[in-house]
Interface confidence: medium
């Protein structure tokens, strides 16, 4: 019979014959012959292959480096790569999430408009009149000044964008 010029799905052409590809999670040890099947071996620990293949080497699982702010989100298997994500307080620097950076903190006088996510940084906004923030934080919004009136007190010291108002007792009229 004529040697094949194309092979079925999950096969590959070598030496004018069709051999079975190795299944995901296995690598090629030796091609098939007239008399023998393709020989495959499972990937070792911390290795994977995610497709039907004829690779002689498995790929190393991705390494989630804590010094780059990364941690394992999903442990790799012989058929899947490890998925890394950013640690609490960090976000990815790229779509591939190969490294992370610390979330920005909003300085005193600024509050958090939008809390950072794993992929986006903190968005800060200046505290408007009547609001303040006295901390550097990646979570705290601007807080409203204390209302002295509702406590039957008077303002002794005006508030700023970084400090709350200071309330004090009302001066009693002397008899």
């Amino acid at each position: 019979p004529e040697p094949p010029t194309a092979c079925r799905e999950k096969q590959y052409l070598i030496n004018s014959q069709c051999c079975s590809l190795c299944q995901p999670g296995q690598k090629l040890v030796s091609d098939c012959t007239e008399f023998t099947e393709t020989e495959c071996l499972p990937c070792g620990e911390s290795e994977f292959l995610d497709t039907w293949n004829r690779e002689t080497h498995c790929h190393q699982h991705k390494y989630c480096d804590p010094n780059l702010g990364l941690r394992v989100q999903q442990k790799g298997t012989s058929e899947t790569d490890t998925i890394c994500t950013c640690e609490e307080g960090w976000h990815c620097t790229s779509e591939a999430c190969e490294s992370c950076v610390l979330h920005r903190s909003c300085s005193p006088g600024f509050g958090v408009k939008q809390i950072a996510t794993g992929v986006s940084d903190t968005i800060c906004e200046p505290c408007p009149v009547g609001f303040f923030s006295n901390v550097s934080s990646a979570f705290e919004k601007c807080h409203p000044w204390t209302s002295c009136e509702t406590k039957d007190l008077v303002v002794q010291q005006a508030g700023t964008n970084k400090t709350d108002v200071v309330c004090g007792p009302q001066d009693r009229l002397r008899a």
Epitope: D65, P66, L68, W90
Partner: antibody
């Protein structure tokens, strides 16, 4: 943080040291082991992070094992095939990774245990 | 391999004076700021002074100041006091993760 007693060991012996922590949780902080040879600099041995994942200095990888017991708040360093070059004061320290709430800091060790002297001699 | 090179020992300063110790890394530290400074006195464990290259650790006097990024870092002590006589170490964190300590710089007060 406080290390267990060191002592005198013979070459080829296995060293086991325990670090007991209090006042904070091993589920938030990493713990590192660092050593200092007499009159010498400091050398990072390795760390165990809040997930229980271990990391080692290249030189220590083949003969060091760090484990933890979160119920007992202890972290253990086991080092095999001791030689005279392993004579040092061994410290455990909190760090280098901490993540939690509004704080995330990395790359530093604080506080440190008082250290324990390990002497390897025949 | 990563190497941290510190100012050669000893460095001396008068009481009230200023000392600057440098720490040079053979390659950039992680995040450009995984660099911390420690003070160590004989018979004691190291004490953290500065982390993140420039952030003062809790309870450390403001006369200690850290600076730098990437591969070049400095620790400056202004208004030297007798109690500041000690050996100072820098530590770098690198992808890997790897942590390397500098050789230490002894500071003596005249």
């Amino acid at each position: 943080v406080k290390e267990s007693e060191g002592g005198l060991f013979k070459p080829t012996d296995t060293l086991t040291l325990t670090c007991t922590v209090s006042g904070f949780s091993l589920s938030s902080y990493a713990i590192s082991w660092v050593r200092q040879a007499p009159g010498n600099g400091l050398e990072w041995i390795g760390a165990i992070d809040r997930y229980g994942t271990t990391y080692y200095a290249t030189w220590a990888k083949s003969r060091s094992t760090i484990t933890r017991n979160t119920n007992e708040n202890t972290v253990t360093l086991k080092m095999t095939s001791l030689t005279a070059a392993d004579t040092a004061t061994y410290f455990c320290a909190r760090g280098p990774w901490y993540y939690g709430g509004d704080v995330a800091w990395t790359g530093s060790f604080d506080p440190w245990g008082p250290g324990t002297l390990v002497t390897v001699s025949s | 391999a990563q190497v941290l090179t510190q100012t050669a020992s000893p460095v001396s300063a008068a009481v009230g004076g200023t000392v600057t110790i440098s720490c040079q890394s053979s390659q950039s530290v992680a995040n450009n700021d995984f660099l911390s400074w420690y003070q160590q006195k004989p018979g004691q464990p190291p004490k953290l002074l500065i982390y993140g290259a420039s952030t003062l650790a809790s309870g450390v006097p403001s006369r200690f100041r850290g600076n730098g990024s990437g591969t070049q870092f400095t620790l400056t002590i202004t208004g030297m006091q007798c109690d500041d006589a000690a050996t100072y170490f820098c530590t770098g964190g690198y992808a890997g993760p790897i942590y390397i300590f500098g050789g230490g710089t002894e500071v003596v007060v005249k």
